[in-house]
């Protein structure tokens, strides 16, 4: 089955400059498949944009402004690149790639799409990291005492732009697990966003990582924030005991600052 | 040129009660296109649903129903049990591809249609409340409430910035909250939840205990051990750079 | 001080031409999408026409359309808006206006028009 | 295209009152595309709100606007003898035409 995978989830432009967009293929051999882009508008349909067929040749949907888009496709790495120029305001949109697959059952056909990049068009470079800034929240002893069970918080600061994908897994898994989060929150010039996972008591003994995608992530790739294994047996100690708390004798936690 | 018109931009659904979503064609007719439903969900992830000709995407068949009323020049789909999974914006989509002659393997989409979802009517079921620290980071965790309107408090004289909560359907149909805060003293923060004219304390919830042990290390790995079994345990983090924060459990 | 001055109006009989022209000053001009925008005597704003920064997307109102050509010359911080085929509709003013561009989001996505043109009368009468 | 219709065409008011202005579209939009605007005789309209909710620069607070979809509102909390005007409202929706509503007059009573 073909698979699509945007691996920029968004790409921030100054007016002016060239966006290069990038859809990766699997599953299906590049050069034997035609891709297509679209693009969404905030507030508009999704429309067809442009395509690349199997043997190379490109269709530009009419209407769509000649030499704004440029498409093409490498083999050698299954990828098709879609190239805006000279990006203004009216491109701002999320591009998604797309192709027909043919399903198992009598040659029937359907069009699955990639998982979309948001073009953003900002007035400024930003210097400063931008980054997601993570601060971890392990299960409160209350939570893990009287329900059979915990909650991990991952509070991500202080990134730009605002599109971000968090999700969970365990330590030496690869499935997903189901999470929940608030909304992306503007704070002065950055953004602000918190997921949280609820696990059984017996998971709270694995290690959990909170995976983070962001475009501004350090070498572009996924930040992964390891959350350390609970344990649930809690000991009563007496308060005059050396493990009692005080300005020096925090639980230190070491977090990530990806800043150059 | 043809024009795909959803019946309604929002549908509320409740979970477990069958909904429909219809989309008219204005221009054409229905019968000489394909249609198709995508599901958009909050990652911008489209997710193919149905294509005429009884298609489904993986997991779509046994929860989704397709169908073409051709008198009417519209496409139905209905979603027979709503889960909070279902949540979306759902896109009807037309193409000819395979129908011979002049044909277009392009797809052709109307707009939107926001599917929201709501638990279904229940028993009022009143919150737990507990309360996580990270230096000056608070976070107040409200779990399984119903019905949905709550307001949440958290207690400080020190307050340096709070955020709006976020209230979310959990997976058993009810709801779930999370409220966070900065403050000078985190530590003395205390969250109070008022729900269905009730109040409720995170302390009414607190274990009685001295223990600051909560977290398990591994034996080898990232440990210092000052005394007994109190253990300082470092949470790692695949990236270069590294700054430490206090943990407060 | 950010301001857009209007020239090219006047008397022009149906059937005849006029060319309109909006200097912009104080601000990166190449930045900014540019409107036209009409009032007919005792009326309404109509939206007339609309160009973006670097000139890729051009859009008309269905009543100009094929006879309005709107055009920019960002190096002379330039708005243009071509009127042939004239009719007695078509007498208004005609304000050329700029559209929003970077607000306090740093993110260009918002849309009105935030600064005018003083406005010029087009009359077009036999 | 999308119509845009404003109520009510007329709205006569003493300074100091509260003046709601009600725009309503033919069918939905983002609430980025919508902006509303002030003119006064011989003079060029000014730009009051964009996004349908944020003050555009200089303006002052007793002027808000909210909604989403297809209703829109302008509220002027307190009515200054300066406030008494046209008001437009206009949506950038999905395509061309750009278009405005008809206009609400706002006079003194």
């Known amino acids: 089955a073909g698979h699509l995978e945007q691996p920029q989830i968004s790409s921030t432009k100054t007016l002016s400059k060239t966006a290069r967009l990038e859809c990766v293929v699997s599953g299906i051999t590049i050069s034997a498949t035609s891709v297509y882009w679209y693009r969404e508008r905030p507030g508009e349909v999704i429309q067809f944009l442009v395509s690349i067929s199997y043997d190379g040749t490109v269709r530009k949907e009419s209407g769509i402004p000649s030499g704004k888009f440029e498409v093409d496709r490498i083999p050698e790495t299954s990828t098709s690149t879609l190239t805006i120029h000279n990006v203004e305001k009216q491109d701002i949109a999320t591009y998604y790639c797309a192709l027909w697959e043919a399903q198992q059952e009598l040659g029937k056909k359907i069009k699955v799409f990639g998982p979309g990049t948001k073009l953003i068009i900002t007035d400024k470079q930003l210097d400063a990291d931008v980054s997601p800034k993570p601060t971890i929240f392990l299960p409160s002893i209350a939570e893990t005492k009287l329900q059979k069970a915990g909650t991990y918080l991952c509070l991500l600061e202080k990134f730009f732009p605002d599109v971000i994908k968090i999700h969970w897994q365990e330590k030496k898994s690869n499935t997903i697990l189901g999470s929940q989060e608030g909304n992306t929150m503007k704070t002065n010039d950055t953004y602000m966003k918190f997921s949280w996972l609820t696990v059984p008591e017996k998971s709270l003994d694995k290690e959990h990582r909170c995976i983070v995608r962001h475009e501004n992530n350090k070498n572009g790739v996924d930040q992964e924030i390891i959350f350390p294994p609970i344990k649930t047996d809690v000991i009563t100690m007496d308060p005059k005991d050396n493990c009692s708390k005080d300005a020096n004798d925090t639980l230190l936690l070491q977090l990530t600052n990806t800043s150059a | 040129a043809i024009e795909l018109v959803p019946e309604h931009q929002t549908v509320p659904v409740s979970i477990g009660v069958p909904a429909t979503l219809r989309c008219s064609m204005k221009g054409e007719a229905i019968g000489n296109y394909y249609i198709n439903w995508y599901r958009k969900t909050q990652g911008n992830t489209m997710t193919f649903i149905y294509r005429e000709k009884d298609i489904y995407g993986p997991g779509f068949k046994d929860n989704f129903q397709g169908d073409i009323d051709i008198a009417k020049n519209l496409a139905v789909l209905k979603i027979l049990a709503p889960s909070e999974r279902d949540e979306g914006s759902y896109y009807c989509a037309c193409d000819t591809l395979g129908m011979g002659g002049e044909y277009t393997d392009k797809l052709i989409f109307g707009k939107g249609t926001r599917v929201t979802v709501e638990p279904r009517s229940q028993p009022h079921t009143k919150p737990s409340v507990f309360v996580m620290k990270n230096g000056t980071n608070v976070a107040c965790l409200v779990k399984e409430f119903y019905p949905k309107d709550i307001r949440i408090n958290l207690v400080s004289s020190k307050k340096i910035t709070e955020f709006d909560p976020a209230i979310v359907i959990s997976p058993s149909g009810k709801y779930n909250a999370v409220k966070l805060g900065k403050y000078e003293d985190s530590n003395s923060v205390t969250c109070s939840v008022q729900h269905d004219n009730k109040t409720v304390h995170s302390t009414d919830f607190e274990v009685k205990t001295d223990s600051t042990d909560h977290v398990k290390p591994k034996e080898t790995e990232n440990t210092k051990q000052p005394s007994k079994s109190c253990h300082k345990p470092k949470a790692i983090v695949h990236t270069e750079k590294v700054n430490m924060m206090s943990l407060t459990v | 001080e950010v301001q857009l001055v209007q020239s090219g109006g006047g008397l022009v009989k149906p059937g005849g031409s006029l060319r309109l022209s909006c200097a912009a000053s104080g601000f990166t001009f190449s930045n900014y999408d540019m409107n036209w925008v009409r009032q007919a005597p005792g009326k309404g704003l109509e939206w007339v026409s609309s160009i973006s920064s670097s000139s890729s997307y051009i859009y008309y109102a269905d009543s100009v359309k094929g006879r309005f050509t709107i055009s920019r010359d960002n190096a002379r911080n330039s708005l243009f808006l071509q009127m042939s085929s004239l009719r007695a509709e078509d007498t208004a003013v005609y304000y050329c206006a700029r559209e929003i561009g970077v607000t306090g989001t740093t993110y260009y996505q918002d849309y009105g028009m935030d600064v005018w043109g003083q406005g010029t009368t087009v009359t077009v009468s036999s | 295209e999308i119509v845009m219709t404003q109520s009510p065409g007329t709205l006569s008011l003493s300074p100091g009152e509260r003046a709601t202005l009600s725009c309503r579209a033919s069918?939905?939009?983002?609430?980025?595309?919508l902006a509303w605007y002030q003119q006064k005789p011989g003079q060029a309209p000014r730009l009051l709100i964009y996004?349908?909710?944020s003050r555009a620069t200089g303006i002052p607070d007793r002027f808000s606007g909210s909604g989403s979809g297809t209703d829109f509102t302008l509220t002027i909390s307190r009515l200054e003898p300066e406030d008494f005007a046209l008001y437009y409202c206009?949506?950038?929706?999905?395509?061309?035409?750009?278009?405005f509503g008809q206009g609400t007059k706002v006079e003194i009573k």
């Open positions: 069918q939905s939009f983002s609430s980025n595309y």
């Open positions: 206009q949506q950038y929706g999905s395509s061309p035409p750009f278009t």
């Open positions: 996004g349908a909710s």
